[in-house]
């Protein structure tokens, strides 16, 4: 099923793309893009009958089109409001400059030792998954090569179902080894929550009476904290699938040389532990310092506030973290009403489908105008 | 409706210490700075310090370091404040006030005599 | 520390008249400057923060002005419970320190 979150990242993909390419490109926007990387999303499932995802593919893509097309108008807008409320809030809290900025300081220690913990188990954990599944893996192959020596004569009967467990089995550890790596970061999205939570009620009273923007500022924080979460999540999941990929053809090689002749079935059987081991020991090396890269990244988010907040704070364009923010809310809001009103759309006569419709479309609407409304 | 409300009037030896109250409602008390402040007969406003209710932070004026000491109770949502050591020259009017743009809301006051 | 110094100590008014206090900081506080009303008896009462803005129900014949090193608080037609002590403090850098006071009473 097509998610809110794989739609929206489409649409920021693409419109941080055309920022970044000149002025006219935003201006003239070419919807048809957008409208072809939407609508490459469904192509998987529309093949089965699937009305849903149709009906789904239908709605979304005006809407879609629309709401990228007002991101594009607010962004500057929204800079400019953004440049307000910074200013406002550094103004309330200047006269305790100091105070505010030590206090930030021992929120990132207190963050980088609710994290170090969970950094350290993730790397000892890579390291043991990796470990384990080479153990696991490396039998096969001595296996194989032990039958091939005993069973020379009936090749194909003795070393084919090996040669499928070992498929099998790869799959069966990396869906393992994703189970066992990603939810560290759920574990960091917590912790992330209770760190900005904390910040949020040490400083609230020196903000007093600007302490709405102070939380919109600490909202931004926390949702540019969550996406690299999520970014950790995404590459962990990423590894193990270029694991995944790495690692099947090495049992595909195995399977397509035992049609061959033996000595073409021995070299290959010889190679096989060598390059599980080698396959396995680069996904370690690769995977094990993204928890520590993911606290950098955390600690450099929270410097960033830090200095937003501070005196000297420079042009920090920070109002694109927003933008993506309030896109995401949007897109989610838009598909919470759409299950929504499927659901209800089955119990529906066809006259109240009718009427529904028309009140969607206007919803539509609302949900698309003013994209992101600061608290004044 | 936001109160303050301070404890009542206290008559103390010199030497002694003495403890005044002042218990916030109507209002998020972990929110906002809580301070007091000292008014001498016929004076003017002397800012002791002031404490951050949510983590206990206190702030004083350098005058007033080991004389006052500031904590809160969170639970009671109240704030107190203890005086050591007193002598006639700590006899005034003690107000808690609230905020940190000026203060937006004052207890009543509490009027401490040192006597022998 | 900064200090406030507040002018006049006192003064003598009518209802209906206008009056005008000072308050100079030792060393520029930017905007961050509060006034209070305190009658006899009573604890002070927030007019102003910020140099400018109006406490909340404020009357608006209280205003506020000036920035950095000269500060002013003006009562338009004074009204009789506008009499009594008036403060300015500044709540820049800690510590905060009060003017020495404008007592403001009836002619």
């Known amino acids: 099923e097509v998610s809110a979150d794989q739609v929206a990242t489409v649409m920021w993909d693409y419109f941080s793309q055309l920022s970044n390419n000149a002025k006219e490109a935003v201006e003239h926007l070419q919807k048809s893009e957008l409208t072809q990387q939407l609508n490459a999303l469904f192509q998987d499932k529309l093949g089965e009958v699937n009305t849903y995802a149709g009906d789904l593919q239908k709605k979304l893509v005006p809407f879609a089109t629309e709401l990228h097309e007002r991101l594009a108008k607010d962004s500057e807008k929204l800079k400019e409001e953004i440049g307000k409320e910074l200013e406002e809030l550094r103004a309330r809290l200047l006269p305790h400059a100091n105070e505010v900025s030590q206090k930030i300081g021992d929120n990132l220690r207190e963050l980088q030792q609710r994290l170090e913990p969970y950094a350290d188990q993730l790397r000892t954990q890579v390291s043991t998954q990796a470990e384990q599944l080479r153990r696991q893996l490396t039998p096969y192959a001595q296996r194989m090569e032990r039958v091939l020596r005993e069973n020379a004569d009936s090749l194909q009967a003795s070393l084919r179902p090996h040669a499928d467990e070992l498929k099998a089995k790869i799959d069966q550890n990396v869906e393992e080894l994703k189970g066992r790596l990603t939810p560290y970061a759920d574990e960091f999205k917590v912790k992330i929550d209770q760190t900005v939570e904390e910040l949020r009620r040490s400083l609230a009273p020196y903000a007093q009476d600007t302490q709405e923007k102070l939380n919109h500022q600490l909202e931004g924080l926390t949702f540019q904290m969550k996406k690299n979460a999520e970014e950790l999540k995404a590459r962990i999941s990423a590894s193990a699938e270029e694991l995944r990929q790495r690692l099947a053809p090495l049992a595909e090689d195995v399977r397509g040389n035992l049609r061959g002749n033996t000595e073409g079935l021995q070299k290959s059987l010889a190679e096989l532990g060598g390059h599980l081991d080698q396959q396995v020991e680069e996904f370690r090396r690769r995977v094990e310092p993204y928890g520590e890269n993911f606290n950098k990244a955390l600690v450099q988010q929270m410097e960033q506030l830090r200095q937003k907040l501070g005196p000297h704070a420079g042009d920090v364009e920070g109002h694109l973290s927003f933008l993506e923010k309030d896109l995401r809310d949007k897109v989610n809001s838009f598909f919470s009403t759409f299950k929504e009103k499927e659901s209800q759309d089955k119990t529906l006569s066809l006259p109240e489908l009718e009427q529904q419709q028309e009140q969607q479309q206007e919803q539509q609407q609302e949900q698309v105008q003013m994209l992101a409304p600061l608290e004044s | 409706e936001v109160q303050l409300q301070q404890s009542g009037p206290e008559l103390v030896k010199p030497g002694a210490s003495v403890k005044i109250s002042c218990k916030a409602s109507?209002?998020?008390?972990?929110?906002?700075?809580m301070s007091w402040v000292k008014q001498s007969h016929g004076k003017s406003l002397e800012w002791i310090g002031r404490?951050?209710?949510?983590?206990?932070?206190?702030f004083y004026n350098q005058k007033f370091k080991g004389k006052a000491t500031l904590t809160v109770d969170k639970s009671s949502s109240t704030a107190h404040m203890e005086l050591l050591s007193l002598t006639s020259e700590d006899s005034a009017v003690y107000y808690c006030?609230?905020?940190?743009?000026?203060?937006?809301?004052w207890g009543q006051g509490t009027t401490l005599t040192v006597s022998s | 520390d900064i200090q406030m110094t507040q002018s006049p100590a006192s003064l003598s008014a009518s209802v209906g008249e206008t009056v005008t206090i000072t308050c100079r900081p030792s060393?520029?506080?930017?905007?961050?400057l509060a006034w209070y009303h305190q009658k006899q008896g009573k604890s002070p009462q927030l007019l102003v923060y910020d140099a400018t803005t109006l406490a909340e129900g404020v009357p608006s014949r209280f205003s506020g002005s000036g920035s950095g090193t000269q500060f002013f608080l003006k009562i338009n037609s004074l009204q009789p419970e506008d009499f009594g002590s008036y403060y300015c403090?500044?709540?820049?850098?800690?510590?905060?320190?009060f003017g020495g006071g404008t007592k403001l009473e009836i002619k």
């Open positions: 403090q500044h709540h820049y850098v800690s510590p905060w320190t």
């Open positions: 109507g209002y998020s008390f972990i929110g906002y700075f």
């Open positions: 006030g609230r905020g940190i743009i000026g203060f937006d809301y």
């Open positions: 404490i951050n209710p949510y983590n206990g932070d206190t």
């Open positions: 060393e520029n506080i930017h905007s961050y």
